[in-house]
Interface confidence: low
């Protein structure tokens, strides 16, 4: 039975040209995390494998950094980065947990969650 829950940063906004950290946290389960996939709509951004470490998709490696933790840092944001992002936790024996984050990249100088790179 899947008892875990994923907490995410939810709906967040950031300034064009800036950076943002996407974070998910799996709780309420003792399942072992074997891999975390980060996806943007249909595109794979990055993988963090428990044995092999991080792999960043080559098409994103100039703008995507691993971490902090199992999170993902997006840099040099553009308006085209606006959209849904998914953290997909592959676990044993539970199976797969998915968290959703919606990122809005703003043209203006003020973003709702303006404190970037903060570690909760």
């Amino acid at each position: 039975m899947m008892t875990g829950t994923i907490e995410t940063t939810g709906n967040i906004s950031a300034e064009k040209g800036g950076s943002i950290i996407l974070q998910c946290h799996l709780s309420s389960t003792t399942a072992q995390v074997t891999q975390v996939n980060w996806e943007q709509q249909d595109q794979l951004l990055a993988i963090c494998n428990a044995d092999l470490g991080w792999h960043i998709s080559p098409s994103f490696k100039d703008r995507v950094a691993p971490g902090p933790g199992l999170g993902l840092t997006l840099q040099s944001l553009t308006v085209n980065d606006t959209g849904e992002y998914f953290c997909i936790y592959h676990t044993y024996p539970d199976g797969t947990y998915t968290g959703r984050i919606f990122l809005e990249v703003l043209e203006s100088s003020v973003a709702e969650h303006g404190a970037r790179f903060q570690i909760p």
């Epitope: 963090c48 470490g53 991080w54 960043i56 490696k61 971490g67 902090p68 933790g69 199992l70």
Partner: nanobody
Framework: EVQLVESGGGLVQPGGSLRLSCAAS????????MGWFRQAPGKEREWVAS???????WYADSVKGRFTISADNSKNTAYLQMNSLKPEDTAVYYC????????WGQGTLVTVSS
């Protein structure tokens, strides 16, 4: 015991350079990515740079072109070369193991002032 020990901080004039070191022990250094973070007085801890075991590096916009992160797996040590330092770089600098951010060192103070 998993441990990280930072060193190399100090007082430097604006425009100067420092090289920070982070000695790691108790885990397989080459299997993780390492990150440098900093915390200025009265501010939240912020990410500065990351290095992946394959040599990939990433930087916060505020330090890009001035700071260089590297790692020597044979010495289990990560480095942060800081050039063209500015007063706003003043902070306590920490390194962290990147897989789970569960291990932090005690930090090393960098003060940029004339």
């Amino acid at each position: 015991e998993v441990q990280l020990v930072e060193s190399g901080g100090g007082l430097v004039q604006p425009g100067g350079s420092l090289r920070l070191s982070c000695a790691a022990s108790g885990f397989v250094f080459s299997s993780d990515w390492m990150g440098w973070f900093r915390q200025a007085p009265g501010k939240e801890r912020e990410w500065v740079a990351s290095v992946l075991r394959g040599g990939y590096t990433w930087y916060a916009d505020s330090v890009k072109g001035r700071f260089t992160i590297s790692a020597d797996n044979s010495k289990n040590t990560a480095y942060l070369q800081m050039n063209s330092l500015k007063p706003e770089d003043t902070a306590v600098y920490y390194c962290a193991r990147g897989d789970s951010m569960d291990v932090w060192g005690q930090g090393t103070l960098v003060t940029v002032s004339s």
